[in-house]
Interface confidence: low
């Protein structure tokens, strides 16, 4: 079953622009720098038109195929497998002029016992087996090779690693007579890196390990191990960085406690506690040492593992993440929200914001959503006037000198971008919400009222009249 969104581009879009890489000199890869938008932010459309025109004029010089697809490669080492014993793999689109490599870890929840893994295998087999994987995938969002869609790293070598281990990329156990399923998420990443070294990764300058949802948590769990692996294999010059999207969860108190019945309603601490034993899960060594034996589950939570990481990591997290709300048993139905639930939701945003206080590179819009970086419209959301690709570009610049993101941001190039307004969609650039029945787009004020947030209650703590607040929201302040 095709269980996950692919955010594919619509057929009507113009074809992707050709590439602008110059041919590298005698076996020497030429670094291509990210686009610096500082001088052009006022007129981005005109700038993009120029880039596109330049790209098209240079296309005849390029030997690259004009093809957006990433191609499937099953691992040659077939002992590194998906849950069902089929070989794991990756999708690759090379960009020979670039020394940047983006490795993206797919998400898709997890399973933590024989029963819900059996069910997952019956209903979401693509997330447990490579047998039905398509030969190619389209790169979207940060995996796109189109500068309009991916102004950040469109020129990079793109690698999409499908999630087929159901273990939040943490497992290290193979299938056996005793184990019905293999859980090899951590080993899959290691093996993909090993194989990519023979496909050009050995010449990389930067390896960005990115991921969304369970893949975002996978980044936090594996980024230091990848850096260590490359050092041990003799590639200490490759800078390893992490980009964790929608994988920074809180082990907070659920709004309504439920027994650990299934993947979605089970409290995350309990699910991970059970899972880590079932998967033979491994966590970063420095984090593991901070907790007693049996308490390794703590390292799956961003705010606990992050301080122990050596590699620089950029954290992207919606303040009102739908997966977080789901595991907290909060379901927004369009019915009026009781005060207790309203306070719970606002407190969740506040807690999330607090955990990002000491994360210098972060992007956290006050939106109700889940995942962003491989959405085609990932460039649209802004925090304090800065888009995510722009923030990532600033992060790159800040890392030229220091290994861990600097506390003193570059002038006009912020990397710590966390919304401070206190309710879902108080940021006007949040992804569009539609009324489920009419299909009409809703503005922020309509959305808040639709959700049952009384404007008087929302305005009061801000010291505003409801009319003033509505005016501010419609003006995008």
């Amino acid at each position: 079953s095709e269980g996950r969104k692919t955010w594919r581009r619509r057929g009507q879009q113009p074809p992707p622009p050709p590439r602008t890489e110059a041919a590298p000199a005698a076996g020497q890869p030429v670094e291509s720098f990210p686009l610096d938008f500082t001088a052009v932010e006022g007129n981005m459309d005109s700038f993009m038109a120029q880039v596109k025109s330049l790209a098209q004029s240079l296309y005849p010089c390029s030997a690259q195929q004009l093809n957006e697809d990433l191609r499937l490669h099953l691992l040659l080492n077939t002992s590194v497998t998906c849950n069902d014993g089929s070989p794991a793999g990756y999708y690759l689109k090379e960009s020979r002029g670039s020394r940047r490599w983006l490795l993206f870890l797919e998400g898709g929840w997890y399973c933590f016992n024989r029963e819900n893994c059996d069910s997952r295998y019956d209903t979401m087999r693509r997330l447990m087996s490579s047998r039905d994987w398509p030969r190619t995938r389209t790169g979207t969002g940060i995996l796109s090779s189109q500068p309009e869609e991916n102004p950040y790293w469109w020129n990079a070598n793109m690698v999409f690693i499908p999630y087929c281990s159901s273990d939040v990329w943490s497992g290290a156990s193979s299938k056996s007579e005793k184990n019905e399923y293999a859980f090899m998420g951590a080993l899959i990443i290691q093996e993909v890196v090993r194989e990519l070294l023979g496909r050009g990764l050995s010449g990389a300058k930067v390896l960005l390990l990115a991921g969304s949802s369970a893949g975002g948590t996978g980044v936090l769990l594996n980024v230091d191990r990848v850096a260590e692996q490359l050092e041990k294999l003799g590639y200490p010059a490759i800078q390893v960085r992490g980009l964790a999207d929608s994988g920074w969860f809180l082990d907070n108190k659920q709004y309504r406690h439920t027994d650990c019945v299934d993947t979605i309603t089970c409290a995350p601490t309990e699910a991970i506690r059970r899972g880590i034993r079932y998967w033979n899960g491994v966590v970063p060594e420095r984090c593991r040492r901070q907790f007693q034996e049996g308490e390794e589950w703590n390292c799956f939570f961003g705010y606990k593992v992050y301080p122990t990481l050596r590699c620089p990591v950029f954290v992207v997290q919606w303040l009102f993440d739908e997966a977080q709300l789901t595991v907290d048993n909060v379901h927004l139905t369009g019915q009026p929200v009781q005060e207790g639930l309203r306070l719970y939701i606002q407190n969740l945003g506040r807690e999330l914001r607090h955990t990002l206080k000491d994360v210098p590179a972060s992007f956290a819009p006050a939106c109700l959503s889940h995942e962003i970086i491989i959405r085609s419209h990932w460039t649209d959301v802004q925090v304090k006037g800065t888009s995510l690709p722009r923030a990532l570009h600033c992060w790159d610049r800040s890392l030229h000198d220091s290994h861990k993101a600097s506390k003193t941001p570059l002038k006009g190039c912020p990397v710590h971008l966390v919304d401070s307004c206190p309710w879902p969609h108080c940021n006007p650039s949040c992804p569009t919400v539609r009324d489920q029945f009419t299909g009409q787009e809703m503005n922020v004020a309509q959305f808040l009222m639709h959700m049952g947030f009384d404007m008087q209650t929302v305005a009061q703590p801000q010291g505003l009249e409801p009319s003033e607040l509505l005016g501010m929201l419609s003006n995008g302040s």
């Epitope: 979401m124 027994d259 299934d262 379901h331």
Partner: antibody
Amino acid sequence: QVQLVESGGGLVKPGGSLRLSCAASGFTFSDFGMHWIRQAPGKGLEWVSYSSSGGTTVYYADSVKGRFTISRDNAKNSLYLQMNSLRAEDTAVYYCARASYDGGYFDCWGQGTTVTVSS
Amino acid sequence: DIVMTQSPDSLAVSLGERATINCRASKSVSTSGYSYIHWYQQKPGQPPKLLIYLASDLESGVPDRFSGSGSGTDFTLTISSLQAEDVAVYYCHHSRELPFTFGQGTKLEI
């Protein structure tokens, strides 16, 4: 093969009680959450109640909360629905159904037992 | 509670023609890429029978003329070429959260 057989339905006066049973066979009963779903004559389907595989978590539709009690005996492969303070609007065919994991869909249904509440 | 609304309430289609039934949820029933929507067929005097689960997966043993699609709040059950034995009432059902709810049903006739 997987089989669910309901029993215990019948005619009862308003305010009366009934206990429905569902006998399961052909699968490991203790591994599955179970549901009761009902269908009033000529009407659509209405979810009534749920019991988790171990019986530790139960849920009820608002329309039956406080009057109906779901329970299970995994040793006997049986699911029960104790119905008290019955009303005319509880008249329906009552089905027990097995819940799939994670997806939550009902992949196996019994034939149903009829409950009629009438004076 | 999530309200499931099916359309139309009844549908008459010629043998061999395509039948389409829609189901709309009052809020999204998709999360992390999975759509918790399922379709059942019920014939007179029988219990419902699962046709499609998780929006688009065909239950084993169900003819492949049945298919499901959609995500978020809008879903469709399609019968590509209607057969006489497809006359029944069809229900959509969500399992995104408790309480589970069903659509009111769509009666399909020839």
